[in-house]
């Protein structure tokens, strides 16, 4: 278990042109309030999908009115932070989305209103335990910044919120199964606490908080037992007569789904499923509208008229999540071919083609020979963006132009002789050796290992390469 | 640098299909949204629709039911349909691409003048 | 939708004046995600501001856009001959996509 902190330092007009109009007026005086909505994981989840973390909202702010003529200043913030309690683990990694509101103070008819000034969502890695970890974000014309940080409540430590402490009963060492607690090297880990009021005898928990059942048990504390009697309802009568007990609260009594959600019993805890227009864990938050803004980032908001019908952000290339928050490495993709160089700019994908090819996405693989030509009768072969000469017998060098000397390469085995030739090079092999390149060795019967000498040449006399 | 260039029948007959094709050069056509916007004689810009090479589309409601839009990447082409034409379909039928910071348009074809007329 | 307003309609002005669009949307625009575009006869339209007042690649800074919310503006601090067209606002946050149905900017 811990909370969630959000501490907002200011809220204005961002930097650049187009400056805000102010959301108040001398005529409509307002105030600002703010709400956040935590949902585990980084997964793409849909904006209306529950806040499953929990959500919070902020105390009004000051009264503020416009003076006349003025720009928008950074608006006067309510006191505090903005705490989201959560009862399981921290998941460490999470979803926010934080919305500004506008409340009219002015002759409203039926008491103030409410409208939404800019909603903010974004996907984080946050370690319970560390410290503020700051932002700023963006919503059209106004800027946002906020810090926020995870806490565990005692006795739960660690970047979880999974590990318990308490203080040691011995002042030397911790109990026998229990490690020192870091950092707090003066307690010690705690035993798994279950969830409370969890039967001590009939339940048990693997997690913190959660309570399992023994068999023969059930209810969300493990206090109703299982009969194998007939009730006469699925929650049992009030008689104990029938051989049916009375089950202890559930976590539905009293339908904690707000405008007209309903519920029902999970393994730990309730779900509310909310009517079309409403969301968040108990369905308390309305629906949001494409009026609202949702869609970052260049995304254009479809659907979503009314409360009644979800939006969908078309989210453009490079960005997406419900509301096109996140951005995609869009390189990961590996859009350029022929192994050309991704670099993606934000605005637009680029390709840094290798030599001999070209286009957007370095697909068309250039005529490497065209306009090339080998000298010395050297034919041109294309290949992986270069082009590359083959030489006629003689010759060498990237165009053919240069002479070869075929005895650079030392072709002659076991000690022979190399002679340039016209026609390519011969070698004089050593004693005892014989072939084109001197490689066969001559049995000393006379007869050779491989090839018989052609007729007229002796082992060990030149040998021709052709 | 990107280029586009619509291709089709300059006359179409009342109730027959319209049918256009741009064709994408300069670019990757996957890494784009690809539209279809249209201007009526001395009138102003309608806006007709949109794909992705997701197979993403999105339509103006009121042409929804007569309107499909589809990509052949191989080609790098993308095409209109439009069933039923009438002569308020009569327009210059321009495509573009979709900007990549946003729904805008930021390069367009020269646009084709489709007449609807028996 | 979002109805766009352009006004005035037709806008007469001389060589080296200053001229001032304006596009009213009927409900905010999202974010401000409104673009302008510029169209001679016989051309297609030619794309100069996105997100109200970032100008496209190789528009003269002559052009400026401002606006958010309902009211944006096109600025052209001093005309060129070459200016002198139809212009159109585009709104791109919520689907369908619109645009003003134009201000015709003539020589005076």
């Known amino acids: 278990a811990g909370v969630f902190e959000l501490q907002i330092h200011s809220f204005g007009p961002g930097p650049g042109p187009g400056a805000p109009r102010s959301p108040c007026s001398a005529r409509l005086p307002c105030r600002l309030f703010f709400r956040v909505c935590l949902k585990p994981g980084l997964s793409e989840e849909a904006a209306e999908s529950p806040c499953a973390l929990g959500a919070a909202l902020s105390a009004r702010g000051p009264v503020y009115t416009e003076q006349p003529g003025a720009p928008a200043p950074d608006l006067p913030l309510p006191d505090g932070l903005l705490q989201v309690p959560f009862r399981d683990a921290w998941p460490g990694t999470f979803s926010f989305i934080i919305e500004t509101w506008r409340e009219e103070l002015g002759d409203q008819i039926g008491g103030p209103a409410w409208s939404l000034l800019a909603r903010v969502a974004g996907r984080r890695r946050l370690a319970a335990g560390g410290p503020w970890a700051r932002d700023i974000q963006r919503a059209g014309a106004w800027e946002l910044r906020f810090s926020y940080r995870a806490r565990c409540e005692p006795p739960a430590v660690g970047t979880a919120c999974t590990r318990l402490c308490r203080p040691r009963s011995a002042p030397s060492r911790c109990g026998p199964g229990l490690r020192p607690c870091a950092p707090l090297e003066d307690e010690c880990e705690a035993p798994l606490v279950c969830r409370a009021g969890c039967s001590p005898e009939h339940g048990f928990c693997e997690q913190p908080g959660e309570c399992r059942c023994l068999e023969g048990w059930t209810g969300p504390l493990c206090t109703v037992p299982v009969s194998t009697s007939s009730c006469l309802s699925p929650r049992g009568p009030s008689s104990a007569t029938t051989g049916c007990l009375v089950p202890g609260p559930g976590p539905c009594d009293g339908n904690p789904c707000a405008n007209g959600g309903s519920c029902s019993e999970t393994p730990r805890s309730f779900e509310c499923t909310c009517p079309r227009g409403f969301y968040g864990l108990r369905c308390e938050v309305s629906g949001v509208t494409c009026a609202d803004g949702p869609c970052f980032n260049g995304g254009l908001c479809v659907g979503g008229a009314d409360p009644d019908s979800a939006y969908i952000c078309h989210c453009p290339p490079g960005f997406q999540g419900s509301n096109c928050e996140k951005r995609v490495d869009r390189c990961s993709l590996q859009p350029c071919r022929n192994g050309g160089l991704c670099l993606d700019l934000g605005h637009a994908l680029r390709c840094r083609c290798r030599a001999g090819f070209a286009g957007p996405r370095c697909e068309h693989d250039l005529d490497d020979c065209a306009g090339r030509a080998c000298a010395n009768g050297g034919t041109c072969v294309e290949g992986g963006g270069a082009h590359r000469c083959s030489c006629a017998l003689g010759f060498g060098g990237r165009d053919c132009r240069e002479r070869a000397d075929p005895c650079a390469a030392r072709p002659c085995a076991h000690g022979g002789r190399c002679y340039a030739h016209f026609s390519g090079l011969v070698c004089a092999c050593a004693p005892g050796y014989m072939g084109a390149r001197c490689e066969f060795p001559v049995h000393p019967d006379g007869a050779s290992a491989l090839p018989a000498a052609p007729p007229g040449l002796r082992p060990g006399d030149p040998q021709r390469y052709l | 640098q990107v280029q586009l260039q619509e291709s089709g029948p300059g006359l179409v007959k009342p109730s027959e299909t319209l049918s256009l094709s741009c064709t994408v050069s300069?670019?990757?056509?996957?890494?784009?949204?690809w539209s279809w916007i249209r201007q009526p004689p001395g009138k102003g810009l309608e806006w007709i629709g949109y794909i992705y090479y997701s197979g993403t589309t999105n339509y103006k409601s009121s042409l929804k039911s007569r309107v499909t839009i589809s990509l052949d990447t191989s080609k790098k082409q993308f095409s209109l349909n439009l069933d039923s034409v009438t002569a308020a379909d009569t327009a210059v039928y321009y495509c573009a691409r979709i900007g990549p910071a946003g729904f805008y348009f930021d390069y367009w074809g020269q646009g084709t003048l489709v007449t609807v007329s028996s | 939708e979002i109805v766009l307003t352009q006004s005035p309609g037709t806008l007469s002005l001389s060589p080296g004046e200053r001229a001032t669009l304006s596009c009213r949307a009927s409900?905010?625009?999202?974010?401000?995600?409104l673009a302008w575009y510029q169209q001679k006869p016989g051309q297609a339209p030619r794309f100069l501001i996105y997100?109200?007042?970032s100008r496209a690649t190789g528009i003269p800074d002559r052009f400026s856009g401002s606006g958010s919310g309902t009211d944006f503006t096109l600025t052209i601090s001093r005309l060129e001959p070459e200016d002198f067209a139809v212009y159109y606002c585009q709104q791109y946050g919520t689907s369908p996509i619109t645009f003003g149905q134009g201000t015709r900017l003539e020589i005076k």
């Open positions: 300069g670019d990757s056509i996957r890494s784009y949204y």
């Open positions: 997100g109200a007042s």
């Open positions: 409900q905010s625009v999202s974010r401000s995600y």
